[in-house]
Interface confidence: low
């Protein structure tokens, strides 16, 4: 038994450029030839345990065999040289691992950053994958002095071991090396102070101003290498619920500062702020954003009066009428603070005013049948809104002028209403709506629209397949005009049930069918038409279509003494629904007819 290898493969650590050719040789030792009674022609080459085809092998002399591979693409191949000892037993002589890959590309896009309080980090693009162990070394030097090399762990970045020296230029480059080659990037020359990324500003605080409800004052602490650098700031803000940030113009924060007043804000609104900084020259990198800080602008008086309307209970000829004044709570954007109460002033045409302070959103008063003027203002701790004014005319006055061409239609999951204004100048419009039902009273909701509006959508939470009664009333300086109403659906559906048909009169050859309208709660849409299907037990089914305005229909040309089955369906724009089947029999003889 030979303890020494029987021979060797050269090269012993082959590394091949992908796509190129490669030749290896196996040299047998003399002692091996004699021990096993072999020569180089007995050599069998194998890659990953598979025999290499004979045409790739050349016997050079009695001790040496070569193998050639063309267009090497596998990343790693185990190559072995074997002999057939005594002509038949295969014995391994030597083995090597053949690697393939590419020489390193020239690294590009070399950039460096000095994170405040840390050493300098440089990054680069190594180019294409080499598939080989490749060492990347970050080199740096002054004109007169070399710095320690930085060996990259990941091949795309390296943090140097030394602290940067500011205000002196440094030269930096990357060397890449593997078994197939060595290459250097272009060098970059810079002052590390121009690559600083400051730590984020901290202790950001926000305070409001009682004098101005449109401003918030910010203050913060900047680092800037412990005061070595002058920093300029970048401030962004958003309302608490918004997702996008608003940018304070950079030209406003260019000079080094640690406080700033943000203007043109909405009153009584919570804002969130963040801030970052960079060297005032603009060189280097923006810091990360500071921790967010929030503040609320001071209250301001309400910016507009509430929507204001009234409802009158019929007086039945008495001297007094009950009037319910109603209004809507202001949205936050118009309340500009917490609404404490509402001031209602009622003035009769010839008498003194009566003032009411109300915390809710309605007030019921008993009024004589005279004309009244009602005004309404909302109050917060800063002050009162302007007043909304309503004229409540005498019940004996007939309302003139109403809107015309009133229409309602669904669009984009909203119920839209449009109209043509009356010929007289309008103060505002009131829209009222409720669900029509035979099972429950019509509970009204309402909204107010400016005089310039003639198309809007209902702003309540509307339900699908419910019939809405919508009323539009123009309001003039002298009081409300005439009201116009219509019905509309946010979204129609097929009816919940079909009509129940019955016979009103049955003759020998005809029958009068009758049915009731489907209750509004089951209609689920506008009933456009009906279909009547009728058949005998053996005949084919006949269908007639009837306009939705009818509640009767006469079937003619019927056979006498015959059982008929009838069913009706009702259709909306979204489909139909059958009612129950009904049967009737035609008589054998007409009235007065004898067999």
């Amino acid at each position: 038994q030979l303890l020494e290898p029987c021979g060797y493969i050269y090269p012993e650590f082959p590394v091949v450029q992908r796509g190129s050719n490669f030749t290896a040789i196996c040299v047998l030792k003399e002692a091996c030839l004699q021990h096993y009674y072999v020569n180089a022609s007995y050599i069998v080459w194998k890659t990953n345990h598979a025999a290499v085809p004979r045409e790739q092998v050349t016997v050079i002399n009695r001790t040496t065999s070569s193998v050639t591979f063309t267009d090497v693409v596998l990343p790693s191949v185990q190559l072995t040289c074997n002999i057939l000892s005594f002509g038949q037993i295969e014995q391994n002589v030597y083995g090597v691992t053949m690697l393939s890959g590419f020489p390193p590309d020239k690294p590009t896009n070399l950039t460096c950053i000095v994170n405040e309080g840390k050493n300098m980090l440089c990054q680069w693009d190594p180019g294409r994958e080499t598939y080989l162990e490749t060492n990347y070394t970050l080199k740096s030097e002054w004109a007169t002095e070399k710095f320690p090399d930085c060996q990259s762990k990941h091949g795309t970045s390296c943090m140097v071991s030394y602290m940067p020296t500011y205000y002196v230029n440094i030269e930096v480059w990357v060397e890449a090396e593997n078994a197939l080659g060595k290459v250097s990037s272009e060098s970059i020359n810079f002052d590390p102070v121009d690559k600083v990324k400051p730590t984020p500003p901290y202790n950001l605080s926000v305070t409001n101003s009682e004098e101005l409800s449109s401003i918030l004052k910010l203050s913060w602490v900047s680092s800037g290498l412990g005061g070595l650098l002058d920093l300029k700031s970048d401030i962004q803000y958003r309302t608490k619920d918004a997702s996008t940030w608003i940018q304070v113009p950079l030209e406003d924060t260019m000079s080094p500062r640690t406080s700033f007043t943000v203007q043109d804000l909405k009153p009584f609104t919570e804002y969130v702020f963040r801030i970052r900084s960079i060297k005032d020259s603009g060189k280097g990198y923006w810091s990360d954003w500071s921790e967010e800080a929030s503040g609320t602008t001071y209250e301001d008086r309400p910016s507009r009066p509430p929507s204001f309307w009234y409802k009158t209970n019929p007086s039945h000829g008495q001297e007094y009428r009950s009037v319910r004044l109603i209004w809507k709570a202001l949205p936050l954007s118009e309340a500009n603070g917490k609404i404490l109460d509402y001031e209602v002033i009622l003035t009769q045409s010839k008498s003194v005013s009566q003032t009411y302070t109300v915390t809710g959103t309605e007030l019921t008063v008993n009024l004589t049948n005279d004309r009244y003027v009602a005004s309404l203002a909302a109050r917060n701790k800063v002050g009162k809104s302007a007043a909304a004014v309503l004229t409540i005319p005498s019940p004996h006055v007939t309302a003139a002028y109403s809107v015309v061409n009133l229409k309602a239609f669904p669009k984009d999951n909203l119920l839209w209403v449009e109209w043509t204004p009356p010929p007289k100048p309008v103060s505002k419009y009131i829209l009222e709506w409720c669900v029509l039902s035979e099972n429950a009273p019509c509970v009204e909701d309402w909204q107010q629209e400016d005089a310039t509006v003639n198309r809007t959508h209902l702003r309540g939470r509307l339900l699908e397949s419910k019939c809405y009664q919508i009323t539009v009333t123009p309001v003039f300086a002298t009081g409300p005009g005439g009201s116009e109403s219509l019905k509309a659906y946010l979204k129609q559906a097929a009816p919940a049930r079909g009509p129940t048909v019955r016979t009103k009169k049955v003759g020998k050859n005809e029958a009068v069918l009758a049915w009731d309208q489907i209750p509004v709660d089951d209609q689920n849409g506008f009933i456009r038409n009906y279909s009547i299907s009728y058949r005998t037990s053996v005949g084919k089914e006949m269908v007639v279509h009837v306009d939705s305005s009818h509640t009767e229909y006469t079937l003619s040309s019927l056979s006498s003494d015959t059982l008929y089955m009838v069913r009706m369906a009702a259709y909306t724009d979204e489909g139909g629904k059958d009612g129950p089947e009904f049967t009737f029999t035609t008589p054998k003889f007409a009235q007065g007819e004898i067999e």
């Epitope: 962004q236 996008t244 940018q247 950079l250 603009g282």
Partner: nanobody, 125 residues
Framework: QVQLQESGGGSVQAGGSLRLSCVIS????????MGWFRQVPGKEREGVAA????????VYADSVKGRFTISQESSKNTVYLEMNGLKLEDTGMYYC??????????????????WGQGTQVTVSS
């Protein structure tokens, strides 16, 4: 949602002119930065010009300085790119882009969040 729609591309002889338009909808126009970028197949998208819609300050790529002009019309929420003295190498797909959070006018494409579909510009000899 934010939408950018470019128009005005087409074919033109070298030395000729084109005017590209980009209409912005879906966010507050006055708080944005707008940029024009172009791309040739097989190459990275490169910045051409940018403008701050609030302050009107502009920046241009060296290759187009003096030939291209970026401008805006706030009332129409539109940004334009006037291209004069067109060269063969100006051929490519031109994209309009917008950013609401960058802090100064830049043609670094990585800082723009919103992009249009592009309009083709072809310059022939």
């Amino acid at each position: 949602q934010v939408q950018l729609q470019e128009s005005g591309g087409g074919s033109v002889q070298a030395g000729g002119s084109l005017r590209l338009s980009c209409v912005i909808s879906g966010f507050t126009y006055k708080q944005t930065f707008m940029g024009w970028f172009r791309q040739v197949p097989g190459k990275e998208r490169e910045g051409v010009a940018a403008i701050s819609t609030g302050g009107g300050s502009t920046v241009y790529a060296d290759s187009v300085k003096g030939r291209f002009t970026i401008s805006q019309e706030s009332s129409k929420n539109t940004v334009y790119l006037e291209m004069n003295g067109l060269k063969l190498e100006d051929t490519g797909m031109y994209y309009c882009a917008a950013s609401t959070v960058i802090t100064s006018v830049t043609i670094n494409r990585g800082l723009y969040q919103y992009w249009g579909q592009g309009t083709q510009v072809t310059v022939s000899s």
